[in-house]
C-alpha cells in the first residue's frame, strides 16, 4: 500500500504519500483553532504508470493509453486514499470546544 | 456537477470532463474484443481552485493552502468521479460472448 | 524481452492443491491473455482454461471445472493456477503461454514449465 | 470437443528430404483456426504456424502450414537436423482448445 509506512521510509518516485505540514494560521488563514497550530496533513504526488496502485478498471485503462500515447495529457493522477479525522480545540467566547474535523490527515494514495 | 452535460457543453478551463475516444487496438493493444472496436472513456483535467468541486475536508484545505502558497507541489487533482460501465462483445473461439466491464466511461469529475 | 517465469518444481499428495504462478513481462500481462497447458510424462498436450488478467474474465476447459482457478494479480503482472483434489493421474509440466490475443489463440511464448507431482 | 487426429504417428526421415504431417479435425475448423507447433525434449512447445498458414516471428521459410475444413497439413521442405522433434497441431475454434497426440520425427 502506498501509506506513509511504506512512502515516508522510501524514496519512491511514483504516486506515493508526502510529508507536509500546514500551519492554521499561515498557510490556511484560518486563526478560529486554538490548538493544535498546525499539523502533518501530507499530501499525495508522483507518476501513475501502468499498475501502479490503479484505482478502478478505467484507472487502468487511461494508465495504458498513456504507456501507448505517451504525449498525451490524459493520464490518472495520484490522489488521497485513506484520510483521517483531526481533533482540534476551538472557542466559543471564553469556552473551550473539542470538535474533530474528519478527513484532514492522507494516510495513503492511490492513481485515480 | 463537471458531468458531460456542463463539461462538452462549456469553454471551462477548471476541473471538468474532457472528451477522449480509446481504440482498443490502437490505444490499448487488446485485441481480445470484438465489439466495440473502441469506445468514449472521456477524461479529467483542469486545474482545482479553491472551492471548485472540492471532495473532502482535505481537499478544501489543500486548495486553501495552494492559494497561500502558489509554487507548492501540493494541490488537489481533477480526477473521476462517476464512472459507468461498458458492455463488450469477445469471442471465445468462434463464440461470441457478451461482458459488462465496470467503471470504464466517466461521466464526471471532481477534484480530489 | 518477452519472458513468462514460472515457479519451482511442487510435489504433492492426492487430494491437496497447487498453485502454480507465472510471472509475465508487463506488456505481455497487460494486452494478453495467459493460458495454462498441461503436459503428463511422456504424454501430449492439454489445455486447462486462460485468463484475460486485465479485467479477470476466466475461461476453463470443462473437464476441469470446479477444480481448477486462474487468476491475476496486477501489482507483480503475475498469473496464478490453482488446482484442486489433486489425483496422481495430475502429475505433469504444467505451463502458462501467452496467446496471440485473442481468448482462445495460438501461444506464442512459453513458460519454462513447473512439474507437479502428486503422490503419497 | 473437436478431436485432432495427426498421422502418422511417427516419420522417419534424413536430413535434406521433404516432410508432410497431416492434422485431421473432427469436425470443420474453418480456414483459420489451427495451429502447429514444435516441441523438443525437456522444452516447451514453439509456435511455428498459426492461422493455418501464416508462420509465426523467427520461423524458418522451410516451416509451411496449409488447409481448411478439417484437413491440414505442415510441410517442411528440407530437414534440418535441428528440425527432429515432436509436432503438434492445435485447434482454437471451440472450447476446449485442443492438441493432436503429436507426429514423431525422427532421424532415418
Known amino acids: 500500500a502506498l501509506d506513509t509506512n511504506y512512502c515516508f521510509s522510501s524514496t519512491e518516485k511514483n504516486c506515493c504519500v508526502r510529508q507536509l505540514y500546514i500551519d492554521f494560521r499561515k498557510d490556511l488563514g484560518w486563526k478560529w483553532i486554538h490548538e493544535p497550530k498546525g499539523y502533518h496533513a501530507n499530501f499525495c504526488l508522483g507518476p501513475c504508470p501502468y499498475i501502479w496502485s490503479l484505482d478502478t478498471q478505467y484507472s487502468k485503462v487511461l494508465a495504458l493509453y498513456n504507456q501507448h500515447n505517451p504525449g498525451a495529457s490524459a493520464a490518472p493522477c495520484c490522489v488521497p486514499q485513506a484520510l483521517e479525522p483531526l481533533p482540534i480545540v476551538y472557542y466559543v467566547g471564553r469556552k473551550p470546544k473539542v470538535e474533530q474535523l474528519s478527513n484532514m490527515i492522507v494516510r495513503s494514495c492511490k492513481c485515480s | 456537477a463537471l458531468d458531460t452535460n456542463y463539461c462538452f457543453s462549456s469553454t471551462e478551463k477548471n476541473c471538468c470532463v474532457r472528451q477522449l475516444y480509446i481504440d482498443f487496438r490502437k490505444d490499448l493493444g487488446w485485441k481480445w474484443i470484438h465489439e466495440p472496436k473502441g469506445y468514449h472513456a472521456n477524461f479529467c483535467l483542469g486545474p482545482c481552485p479553491y472551492i471548485w468541486s472540492l471532495d473532502t475536508q482535505y481537499s478544501k484545505v489543500l486548495a486553501l493552502y495552494n492559494q497561500h502558497n502558489p509554487g507548492a507541489s501540493a494541490a488537489p487533482c481533477c480526477v473521476p468521479q462517476a464512472l459507468e460501465p461498458l458492455p463488450i462483445v469477445y469471442y471465445v473461439g468462434r463464440k461470441p460472448k457478451v461482458e459488462q466491464l465496470s467503471n470504464m466511461i466517466v461521466r464526471s469529475c471532481k477534484c480530489s | 524481452e518477452v519472458q513468462l517465469v514460472q515457479s519451482a518444481a511442487e510435489v504433492k499428495k492426492p487430494g491437496a492443491s497447487v498453485k502454480v504462478s507465472c510471472k509475465t513481462s508487463?506488456?505481455?500481462?497487460?494486452?494478453?491473455?495467459i493460458s495454462w497447458v498441461r503436459q503428463a510424462p511422456g504424454q501430449g498436450l492439454e489445455w486447462m482454461g486462460g485468463?484475460?488478467?486485465?479485467?479477470?474474465?476466466?475461461n476453463y476447459a470443462q473437464r476441469f471445472k470446479g477444480r481448477v482457478t486462474i487468476t491475476a494479480d496486477e501489482s507483480t503482472s503475475t498469473t496464478y493456477m490453482e488446482l484442486s483434489s489433486l489425483r496422481s493421474e495430475d502429475t505433469a509440466v504444467y505451463y502458462c503461454?501467452?496467446?496471440?490475443?485473442?481468448?482462445?489463440?495460438?501461444?506464442?511464448?512459453w513458460g519454462q514449465g513447473t512439474l507437479v507431482t502428486v503422490s503419497s | 470437443e473437436t478431436v485432432l487426429t495427426q498421422s502418422p504417428g511417427t516419420l522417419s526421415l534424413s536430413p535434406g528430404e521433404r516432410a508432410t504431417l497431416s492434422c485431421r479435425a473432427s469436425?470443420?475448423?474453418?480456414?483459420?483456426?489451427l495451429a502447429w507447433y514444435q516441441q523438443k525434449p525437456g522444452q516447451a512447445p514453439r509456435l511455428l504456424i498459426y492461422?493455418?498458414?501464416s508462420r509465426a516471428p523467427g520461423v524458418p521459410a522451410r516451416f509451411s502450414g496449409s488447409g481448411s475444413g478439417t484437413d491440414f497439413t505442415l510441410t517442411i521442405s528440407s530437414l534440418e537436423p535441428e528440425d527432429f522433434a515432436v509436432y503438434y497441431c492445435?485447434?482454437?475454434?471451440?472450447?476446449?482448445?485442443?492438441f493432436g497426440q503429436g507426429t514423431k520425427l525422427e532421424i532415418k
Open positions: 485468463v484475460i488478467p486485465i479485467v479477470d474474465i476466466a
Open positions: 503461454a501467452s496467446t496471440l490475443g485473442l481468448v482462445l489463440d495460438a501461444m506464442d511464448y
Open positions: 492461422g493455418a498458414s
Open positions: 508487463g506488456y505481455i500481462f497487460i494486452s494478453n491473455v
Open positions: 469436425q470443420s475448423l474453418g480456414s483459420s483456426y
Open positions: 492445435q485447434q482454437y475454434a471451440d472450447s476446449p482448445i485442443t
